[in-house]
Amino acid sequence: DTHKSEVAHRFKDLGEEHFKGLVLVAFSQYLQQCPFEEHVKLVNEVTEFAKTCVADESAENCDKSLHTLFGDKLCTVATLRETYGEMADCCAKQEPERNECFLQHKDDNPNLPPLVRPEVDVMCTAFHDNEATFLKKYLYEVARRHPYFYAPELLFFAARYKAAFAECCQAADKAACLLPKLDELRDEGKASSAKQRLKCASLQKFGDRAFKAWAVARLSQKFPKAEFAEVSKLVTDLTKVHTECCHGDLLECADDRADLAKYMCENQDSISSKLKECCDKPLLEKSHCLAEVENDEMPADLPSLAADYVESKDVCKNYAEAKDVFLGMFLYEYARRHPDYSVMLLLRLAKAYEATLEKCCAAADPHECYAKVFDEFQPLVEEPQNLVKQNCELFEQLGEYKFQNALLVRYTKKVPQVSTPTLVEVSRNLGKVGAKCCKLPEAKRMPCAEDYLSVVLNRLCVLHEKTPVSEKVTKCCTESLVNRRPCFSALELDEAYVPKAFNAETFTFHADMCTLSEKEKQVKKQTALVELVKHKPKATKEQLKGVMDNFAAFVEKCCKADDKEACFAEEGPKFVAASQAALA
């Protein structure tokens, strides 16, 4: 399906609004430090150029690839070397190396100030004064902070952002209407970004076979009534979409995602009974709805897998003839029977089955060798089941904040070399699994919990790759995608770690503590907790609890004092001394 002008093709397919939005996202994800106005100028230039190509596909440069056009445009930025340093060297390369170079310089933790939310009236005025600029600013600010955000999904978030302002800026109580909606968009956006980051890591670090295996398992759980051939077709198309988005090919990605949504809605009968309500919606909403659709009901009478995958005399023959197809069918059959398993567990089971066939199909009596293969699955299944049970019990006992603290201690002891902000961020997010998953019925707990943990641990891996400090983290992150979570779970106290020297400055607090939001206070306390564990990795739970209780009491006391700063100055050193004594 070749076109004389790729840029004209995509402009016509996507329409001007989506075209401009996606180009802005692409540029903002590549050049994360550039000012908004610079990006808007570049986008307008690209859009004008695209229009000339729509008018005449044979016009000069219209035959160039999108990477060439976009890369040339990015390389016109005057301050590239001053702002980005060695990323400017990318511009000396030819495509496709230049694009690969830009991709490698995407920064998962850019040094950008946290977004501050202005007063509601200020936001509503800005929205009414220039709606288009207001929405572009949203795309820009999110995209530069989340350089792997799923671009067509970000357009959907922007549409919801626009709808929230359109509705709430006319409401009697603007704040009561708007703020909960913005909070929801922020939280959903962070979750969406993290989920997409795992997809990109899967493709980039482990290859498309790993991503396809993930997709077979997940789509088979979602669409258990669909035939294997149908699931395979969806997996192939979905892999193409995500490969494009993760590779910075956002126009192609959005176009192909729209095609996939169209195909699914035209073929609902052979996919799932749950697609109907999604398919009546407009494009962005439809694609989002299809991606989030609930699992269809399992067919009534699915037979055991033993006949085809253990008892059949043709197991090794079928495996040898087409290994990936045979394993894909095994994964499909297993996953459609087990929506109660995490995708990662299903992939571990497929891996174990593959390893058994590799060994047994070379043995003297293959059938005798693999006859008990399913028995070997039991411990693999019970490990995450037990983990979820234990951690949900702990969450119910402690509540979210103290559960996060337990995880902070646990993970700091495992990998104390990791930076404190990273440990705090990751452990806080690990702790959110409780509220998210533990309230669910038994059959939904494991898929919710383990697949969420995989997303959070990928964030740790991505941050650690940028600044590697722990061989144990590197090992867990790189050896096996499906075994990352069990690898981290299995880590014990790092005996080789030399405790961090005590630094009183780390435990010095001021009156500004009192004006912080509850969340910010928690982060401060959790930062101190990590530093305590780094100083005394062998401290007991009781010792740490004692210090943290004293800390909370000290902060509460000083925040109630008339002269807060004087209180912190006087009581702070006492708290530090008492803490050191308690941990001695």
């Epitope: 699992n295 009901e297 399992m298 009534a300 009478d301 699915l302 037979p303 055991s304 897998l305 033993a306 253990v310 297993y334 029977r337 087990h338 929506p339 109660d340 399913f374 028995d375 699955f377 039991q378 299944v381 019970e382 019925p441 059959a443």
Partner: nanobody
Framework: QVQLVESGGGLVQPGGSLRLSCSAS????????MGWYRQAPGKQRELVAS???????HYADTVKGRFTISRDNSKNMVYLQMNSLRAEDTAVYYC?????????WGQGTQVTVSS
């Protein structure tokens, strides 16, 4: 070794009720399907009702609205509540539990609906 034992069958008048129970002894893990089947004299065994791991229930058209299947995961038990029984419900009722590694059947319990 897994063994399934059905109970609760017996003789009942048309319009009456029975509750069948099936318990699994032995180690059976990873159950994805629990079902009740029946076989009347001279007929094929047929699915009456099943419940899958996601909680989906399925019923034969002839029993819809009269029979209810339920389970207790923690005890590996499956039940069949049968109301408004008819003469044509007379059969041996079998319990079936499946995991990926096998299909496990009970010995059956006789249900006779007669006045």
């Amino acid at each position: 070794q897994v063994q399934l034992v059905e109970s609760g069958g017996g003789l009942v008048q048309p319009g009456g009720s029975l509750r069948l129970s099936c318990s699994a002894s032995g180690s059976i893990w990873g159950i994805y399907h629990m079902g009740w089947y029946r076989q009347a004299p001279g007929k094929q065994r047929e699915l009456v009702a099943s419940i899958t791991v996601d909680g989906s229930t399925h019923y034969a058209d002839t029993v819809k609205g009269r029979f209810t299947i339920s389970r207790d995961n923690s005890k590996n038990m499956v039940y069949l509540q049968m109301n408004s029984l008819r003469a044509e419900d007379t059969a041996v009722y079998y319990c079936d539990i499946r995991n990926v590694g096998g299909d496990y059947w009970g010995q059956g319990t006789q249900v006779t609906v007669s006045s």
